[in-house]
Amino acid sequence: DGNTTRTPETNGSLCGAPGENCTGTTPRQKVKTHFSRCPKQYKHYCIHGRCRFVVDEQTPSCICEKGYFGARCERVDLFY
C-alpha cells in the first residue's frame, strides 16, 4: 500500500496499510496510533496517496502510492 508519512514530522512509525500494527518506537511505552478519515478540507492534501487523520494529534498523514514519498506524497521515488 505504500509509505505513510505525516506532518508535522515526529518520531515513531505509522500504519502503512490497514491491519498493520501501529506502534510507537519508544521502547518503554508502545502507543497505538489511531486514525480516522481526513476532514473534507484535506481532500487534496495528499498528492499521490490517501489521507488519514491522526486522531490524538488532530493532524493529517498520508499513505503514499507506490513510487511516491514525502509528507504529502509529493516526491517521486526515482529508484522505484
Partner: antibody, heavy 119, light 107 residues
C-alpha cells in the same frame, strides 16, 4: 460474496446483559473498521459504536460505560457486549463495515438482530 | 453535538424528480452519504462522498452538497424507489444520521 451476519439478540430484562456477534465473510476482516448501528421500532438509524482495525473504539454518549465493542480477527467476528440494558435500548442492531478507516461510510450491512428490553 | 435535519416525508409522482434535503451547520464542509432502507430490510448505500454512486446504483440517483444543505435527487422516480432515506455525516469522531425521510411515489 461480502457478508455480515448478526446474532445474539433476544428478550432481556432491564438491567440485564446481552452479547451480540457479527460474523464477517468474503473480505479481509482485520483490515476494516467496523460499527454497530441500531434502529428502534418505527424510528430512524442511530450509530452506537465503532472499532478501528487497530483497536480504537468510540461510542455514542448514551451507551458509554454500558456497552463494549470488540473484535476477534482470528474468528472474523465483531462483538457488542451490552450491560445495564434499558428499555430505550430496544432496537434492531445492525453490524456495518466502514469503508477503509473511521469517518468514511458504511458500504456493507448485516440484516440485523432484534434486542428487546422489557420486564 | 452535530445535528442533521431531514423532512419527515416527500412525495413524488411516478416518473418525476424527487429531492430530499439534509440540513446541518456548514454541512458543505463535510462528506455526506445517503442510504435507502425498505421495510424489513437493512439500509443500502446509494450515494457516498456527496455525489458518488456505488456500483449497482442507477444513474437516476445523484447527490449534491454545499452551504448548509445536502440534497439527494432521484430522477424518473419508480415505484421501487419508495423507501426511507437517511443522510449521514461524520463529526468529532462519531457518526451522525439524519432523522430519515419517507419517500412516497404516487400513481
Amino acid at each position: 460474496q461480502v457478508q455480515l451476519l448478526e446474532s445474539g439478540g433476544g428478550l432481556v430484562q432491564p438491567g440485564g446483559s446481552l452479547r451480540l456477534s457479527c460474523a464477517a465473510s468474503g473480505f479481509t476482516f482485520s483490515s476494516y473498521a467496523m460499527s454497530w448501528v441500531r434502529q428502534a421500532p418505527g424510528k430512524g438509524l442511530e450509530w452506537v459504536s465503532g472499532l478501528g482495525h487497530v483497536g480504537y473504539t468510540t461510542y455514542t454518549d448514551s451507551v458509554k460505560g454500558r456497552f463494549t465493542i470488540s473484535r476477534d480477527n482470528s474468528k472474523n467476528t465483531l462483538y457488542l457486549q451490552m450491560n445495564s440494558l434499558r428499555a430505550e435500548d430496544t432496537a434492531v442492531y445492525y453490524c456495518a463495515r466502514d469503508y477503509l478507516d473511521f469517518g468514511y461510510y458504511f458500504d456493507v450491512w448485516g440484516q440485523g438482530t432484534l434486542v428487546t428490553v422489557s420486564s | 453535538s452535530y445535528e442533521l435535519t431531514q423532512p419527515l416525508s416527500v412525495s413524488v409522482a411516478l416518473g418525476q424528480t424527487a429531492r430530499i434535503t439534509c440540513s446541518g451547520d456548514k454541512i458543505g464542509k463535510k462528506y455526506v452519504h445517503w442510504y435507502q432502507q425498505k421495510p424489513g430490510q437493512a439500509p443500502v448505500l446509494v450515494i457516498y462522498d456527496d455525489s458518488d454512486r456505488p456500483s449497482g446504483i442507477p444513474e437516476r440517483f445523484s447527490g449534491s452538497n454545499s452551504g448548509n444543505t445536502a440534497t439527494l435527487t432521484i430522477s424518473r422516480a419508480q415505484a421501487g424507489d419508495e423507501a426511507d432515506y437517511y443522510c449521514q455525516a461524520w463529526d468529532m469522531q462519531s457518526v451522525v444520521f439524519g432523522g430519515g425521510t419517507k419517500l412516497t411515489v404516487l400513481g
